[in-house]
Interface confidence: low
């Protein structure tokens, strides 16, 4: 059977969801006036960078858009960006596309995404509404790095 990405609604502990604003992802409150993105998630077949301690290696995309999350350094700082790319194009590549890869780890009922390119840097939302989704190495009170994934049929 041909592989297909799994679809998830994603929210954090403060009920912030991910919203597409232009070609950026921002965190916004879960509410009727906001249209959150649906996250596409698919496992990477290449095991080159795998580390079971850190979780499963996955590609992350935005459902209905040819946009995928990737990590790049800007002015010396790891940064989360969206790139025009179909998630299935990444999946079919024999070699792992490292900038697009994240370790997906389960912590209780939550999910944590760590950059493969930049170990120790995690996808995060700010506690303030309207801020971009970003990478952080500071896991704690001011940044939310744990997300709830609600399966979408």
């Amino acid at each position: 059977r041909e592989a297909a990405p799994k679809s998830y609604a994603i929210r954090d502990s403060r009920q912030m969801v991910w919203v597409l604003s232009g070609n950026s992802l921002i965190a916004a409150p879960l509410s009727r006036s906001i249209k959150p993105v649906t996250l596409h998630l698919i496992a990477c077949r290449d095991t080159e960078f795998s580390d079971k301690e850190k979780g499963n290696m996955v590609y992350l995309g935005i459902k209905g858009k040819d946009l995928c999350l990737f990590c790049a350094e800007i002015q010396g700082k790891p940064t989360l960006q969206l790139k025009e790319k179909n998630i299935m194009d990444l999946y079919v590549e024999k070699k792992a596309q490292k900038p697009f890869l994240f370790f997906h780890n389960k912590e209780g009922s939550t999910s944590v995404f760590q950059s493969v390119s930049y170990p120790g840097w995690f996808i995060a939302t700010s506690t303030t509404s309207g801020q971009p989704i970003f990478l952080t190495k500071e896991r704690g009170i001011t940044n939310n790095t744990n997300f709830y994934l609600d399966s979408v049929e």
Epitope: Q15, P29, L30, S31, R32, G108, S109, T127, Y148, D150
Partner: antibody, heavy 122, light 111 residues
């Protein structure tokens, strides 16, 4: 039709643990996108949200009660429960269980139990 | 003191229109979180009256309507009837508290 029924002791001694159970009928407690909550109402006062547990097992608690509250689910009995430790007279209230659904957003508590009065007294 | 502020009481004669306000802040209603309204008749459990700011669950008469603007929300009841005499509560989510919050409640008296 989804129905909820609270049960548990009506009298609890100070410093002890209040334990209540909510039995769900007419639907499954594991249904996707549902959340299950507890709300209380002291005599003659307003409503206070205690906490929720959702279909993923994730819990959300009122910050002012968080250190004393545990909400859990028993899927085999189609029940969810509330435990509130170290109770005082200020915890005397009618306790309601309630449920609602996520549909791209939180839609409020649309089904409620009838409520059960818990008195904290020695 | 409640995070969401409601008037303790409002009153109106049968057939009249009354409104109940619910004032929050930039961390709840003002942060675009939805507002829900509940009606609690004497001696009974609360009942969801309005969800998602302005939506009525099936079975709720169209005499009840909700609206939201800025950091406040309102519940309007037109054609007031004796059976509307009850306590009314607003509810929202507050991200600074990471939890759901209720207003203090408003007692509606039908004169």
């Amino acid at each position: 039709e989804l129905q909820l029924q609270e049960s548990g002791p009506g009298l609890v001694k100070p410093s002890e643990t209040l334990s209540l159970t909510c039995t769900v009928s007419g639907g499954s407690i594991t249904s996707t996108n549902y959340y299950w909550g507890w709300i209380r109402q002291p005599p003659g006062k307003g409503l206070e949200w205690i906490g929720n547990i959702d279909y993923t097992g994730s819990t959300y608690y009122n910050a002012s009660l968080k250190s004393r509250v545990t909400i859990s689910v028993d899927t085999s009995k189609n029940q969810f429960s509330l435990k509130l430790s170290s109770v005082t007279a200020a915890d005397t209230a009618v306790y309601y269980c309630a449920t609602g659904k996520y549909y791209e957003t939180y839609l409020g508590f649309d089904v409620w139990g009838q409520g059960t009065l818990v008195t904290v007294s020695s | 003191e409640s995070v969401l502020t409601q008037p303790p009481s409002v009153s109106g004669a049968p057939g009249q229109r009354v409104t109940i306000s619910c004032t929050g802040s930039s961390s709840n209603i003002g942060a675009h979180y939805d507002v829900h309204w509940y009606q609690q008749l004497p001696g009974t459990a609360p009942k969801l009256l309005i969800y998602g700011n302005d939506n009525r669950p099936s079975g709720v008469p169209d005499r009840f309507s909700g609206s939201k603007s800025g950091t406040s929300a309102s519940l309007a009841i037109t054609g007031l009837q004796a059976e509307d005499e009850a306590d009314y509560y607003c509810q929202s989510y507050d991200y600074s508290l990471s939890g759901y919050v209720f207003g203090g409640g408003t007692k509606l008296t039908v004169l």
